[in-house]
């Protein structure tokens, strides 16, 4: 169908406009590359050649003034559907006295170089040459919309044609589609949809879970306010114009929920007083994790069942649980939270601390000479069970003998049974300094405070013991 539209909705004067849905006269392949314009030489009308448009030089030049050169008026506005073909042209008659004329096509202020299908034909006469520059597009796209003009350079002057407005009409084209969102249950949120023609207007219908939301269409752009959801929903919008309808992508609106518990917990390392754990978070409930809680309780059935809670950041899914008892069994659970709340605790897992060296020294260390004066008797109390940090395997006794100019240190190992030891006198008329440490497989604990006893010369006996008091007995 062809229809004259004398004054379309574009600024500027036009002689007319054309709405066309017919295929072009020229079925040239639509290419995106560049190629030189085809031209027919006036001297050899049937043979195309490439190069600048050049009017054949005329030898005799008349002196009478020439009328101003101008492109002839042509169709000013062409409306057509997307993917159709179009051909338009501009024509001009140029006196033969002019040489080196070139015609170029411009769109929206930019020169169209190369492979747009531009053909220039020459029709020479005695005094003038009619030039028709044709431009064809075999399958128009939205990007072909715009204002096209011809320019001719002649003797350093530029002649510009009236614009030809190409309006490519098609199905609505989305410039803004709804976006997936994670929303709080029963809380209002907005979705936006915007589509453009031509042709305008574009009307919007909203669709929720395959059902239309609005009975009456809204002009684009449209904002849908959803008062709140209780479960996940899929929204899309339909954009309608005279050419038909386009449906946006469907977007999922998720309802934020409490997270799932972690799917894995790993015991990375254990020491006497700490356990390093890592975890793999569960599903986040459509809301980022904020922090995590590590719950620890003694696995011993005789324990009081109290739970220690360690809070940490959600990342890096790693935590060192500290201040634990040595050689103890623990149950560990991990829970993480998002803005909605805490996940359930993961299934409880078991972990143990290793043996450590005792954390305190033996108590009540007492040292005295026995009756024969050949030995020093040492007595002590074992460290409290909680502070042994393992199973006692024995004790290490350090005894230092000091007399004028002599100092001698000896170490003794004694078994775990009992709490006494006897050491031989090494030097008479000397001071013996005794310290004792408890030993587990985890190592040697701290030594007790030194206890000194004087060992007299032969024949002098002092039975008074030396001792370190037990804590609280001082």
């Amino acid at each position: 169908r062809e229809e004259a539209k004398p004054y379309p909705l574009f600024p500027g004067p036009f002689p007319g406009s054309l709405q066309t849905d017919h295929t072009p006269l020229l079925s040239l392949p639509h290419a995106s590359g560049y190629q030189p314009a085809l031209m027919f030489s006036p001297t050899q009308p049937g043979r195309p050649h490439t190069g600048n448009v050049a009017i054949p030089q005329v030898t005799s030049v008349e002196s009478k003034p020439l009328p101003p050169l101008a492109f002839k008026h042509t169709v000013g506005h062409i409306i057509l559907s997307e993917h159709k073909g179009v051909k338009f042209n501009c024509s001009i008659s140029v006196p033969n006295i002019y040489q080196d004329t070139t015609i170029s096509w411009w769109k929206d202020g930019k020169e169209l170089l190369g492979a747009h299908h531009a053909i220039t034909q020459f029709y020479p006469d005695d005094e003038v040459t009619a030039i028709i520059a044709s431009f064809s597009i075999t399958s128009v796209q939205r990007s072909d919309n715009g204002s096209y003009i011809c320019k001719m350079k002649i003797n350093n002057e530029e002649i510009v044609s009236d614009p030809i407005y190409i309006e490519v009409q098609g199905l609505p084209h989305f410039t803004k589609q709804p976006e997936s969102m994670n929303v709080t249950r029963n809380t209002a949120f907005n979705l936006t949809c915007q589509a453009v023609g031509p042709p305008e207007p574009v009307n919007i219908f909203w669709v929720q879970n395959s059902s239309r939301v609005n009975e009456q269409p809204e002009k684009s752009p449209s904002v849908l306010t959803v008062p709140g959801l209780t479960e996940m929903a899929v929204f899309s919008c339909e954009a309608h114009n005279d050419k038909g309808l386009t449906v946006s992508k469907g977007v999922q609106i998720n309802i934020k929920a409490i997270p799932s518990p972690p799917t894995e917990v790993s015991i990375r390392n254990s020491t006497a007083h700490s356990i390093l754990i890592s975890w793999v978070p569960g599903f986040d409930g459509y809301s980022p994790f904020r922090n995590c809680s590590i719950q620890v309780k003694e696995a011993d059935p005789l324990s009081n069942g109290s739970v220690m809670i360690f809070n940490t950041s959600a990342l890096p899914h790693l935590y060192q649980i500290k201040q634990l008892q040595a050689l103890a069994n623990y149950s560990i659970g991990v829970s993480c939270m998002n803005e909605i709340g805490w996940s359930a605790v993961s299934p409880w897992i078991l972990a143990s601390t290793t043996e450590g060296a005792p954390s305190v020294a033996p108590l009540n260390v007492t040292v005295f000479l026995n009756e024969s004066s050949d030995n020093v008797d040492i007595r002590w109390m074992k460290p409290p069970t909680k502070q042994q940090d393992g199973e006692l395997v024995g004790y290490r006794i350090s005894h230092v003998w000091q007399s004028a100019g002599i100092s001698k240190e000896l170490l003794e190992e004694v078994g775990q049974n009992g709490s006494r030891a006897r050491i031989s006198v090494q030097v008479h008329n000397a001071t013996c300094t005794v310290r004792i440490a408890a030993v587990t497989r985890g190592g040697v604990g701290p030594f007790s405070d030194p206890v000194k006893i004087f060992i007299p010369a032969h024949g002098w006996v002092d039975y008074a013991p030396s001792s370190t008091p037990a804590p609280g007995n001082a």
Epitope: P261, P262, T263, E264, V265, S266, I267, R268, N269, S270, V280, P281, G282, F283, S331, S346, P347, W348, I349, L350
Partner: antibody
Framework: EQQLVESGGGLIQPGGSLRLSCAAS????????MSWVRQAPGKGLEWIGI???????YSASWAKGRFTISKDSSKNTMYLQMNSLRAEDTAVYFC??????????????????????WGQGTLVTVSS | DAQLTQSPSTLSASVGDRVTITCQSS????????LSWYQQKPGKPPKLLIY???DLASGVPSRFSGSGSGTEFTLTISSLQPDDFATYYC???????????FGGGTKVEIK
């Protein structure tokens, strides 16, 4: 919808090799341990092995050496490579998601809490 | 290797009956409660029913219940329904061992 789909089963001659695949959808293998379980015709379930979310693998003692579990997280797919197949390996092979898993890295073992999602299974027949 | 022994291996019952299946472990289950029960129908994969010895999996009817700790566990169906005729497996893990052991199964059939 969360689901598991096994593939790669079929008829294989004794001594041959086969690779089974388990494609997961609706959840990520990067966040879940996965397991293989088999069931000989008319028999009970037999655990084959597990691959943790980080890619550590643990296998039943009978499966070590012949069966290898691996995964491609970018394809969200787990695999079971079976070598030196025998007639007694004839079974339906199921892949299953591990609902929770505890790993003891220092001791190189891990324990499954539960298998909460199963595939339909793929039949492997070893016969000459 | 630890073993799970289920009894009985076959059980004939009628709709409405109360059904009890036991599962005995040769050593203590991890954390004393990491035992699960699965239901399997012919030609179908197993389905998780119960975990942590007594917690019902999502979507499982309340007529199913589990109990026990350590080495002795029980699955009870309070009132057998037509949909419950199937084979039931217990399964669990153990400290110090990666193996996930399945019981031999109990087939619940129509009397």
């Amino acid at each position: 919808e969360q689901q598991l789909v096994e593939s790669g089963g079929g008829l294989i001659q004794p001594g041959g090799s086969l690779r089974l695949s388990c494609a997961a959808s609706g959840f990520s293998l990067s966040s879940n341990a996965m397991s293989w379980v088999r069931q000989a015709p008319g028999k009970g379930l037999e655990w084959i092995g597990i691959i943790s979310s980080s890619g550590s693998t643990y296998s039943a003692s009978w499966a070590k050496g012949r069966f290898t579990i691996s995964k491609d997280s970018s394809k969200n797919t787990m695999y079971l490579q079976m070598n030196s197949l025998r007639a007694e390996d004839t079974a339906v092979y199921f892949c299953a998601r591990v609902g929770f898993f505890v790993g003891y890295g220092a001791y190189d073992y891990g324990i499954i809490h539960r298998l909460d999602l199963w595939g339909q299974g793929t039949l492997v027949t070893v016969s000459s | 290797d630890a073993q799970l022994t289920q009894s009985p291996s076959t059980l004939s019952a009628s709709v409405g009956d109360r059904v009890t299946i036991t599962c005995q472990s040769s050593k203590s289950i991890y954390n004393n409660n990491w035992l699960s029960w699965y239901q399997q129908k012919p030609g179908k994969p197993p389905k998780l029913l119960i975990y942590d010895a007594s917690d019902l999996a999502s979507g499982v009817p309340s007529r199913f219940s589990g109990s026990g700790s350590g080495t002795e566990f029980t699955l009870t169906i309070s009132s057998l329904q037509p949909d419950d005729f199937a084979t039931y497996y217990c399964a669990g893990g153990y400290s110090g061992d990666s193996d996930y052991a399945f019981g031999g199964g109990t087939k619940v059939e129509i009397k």
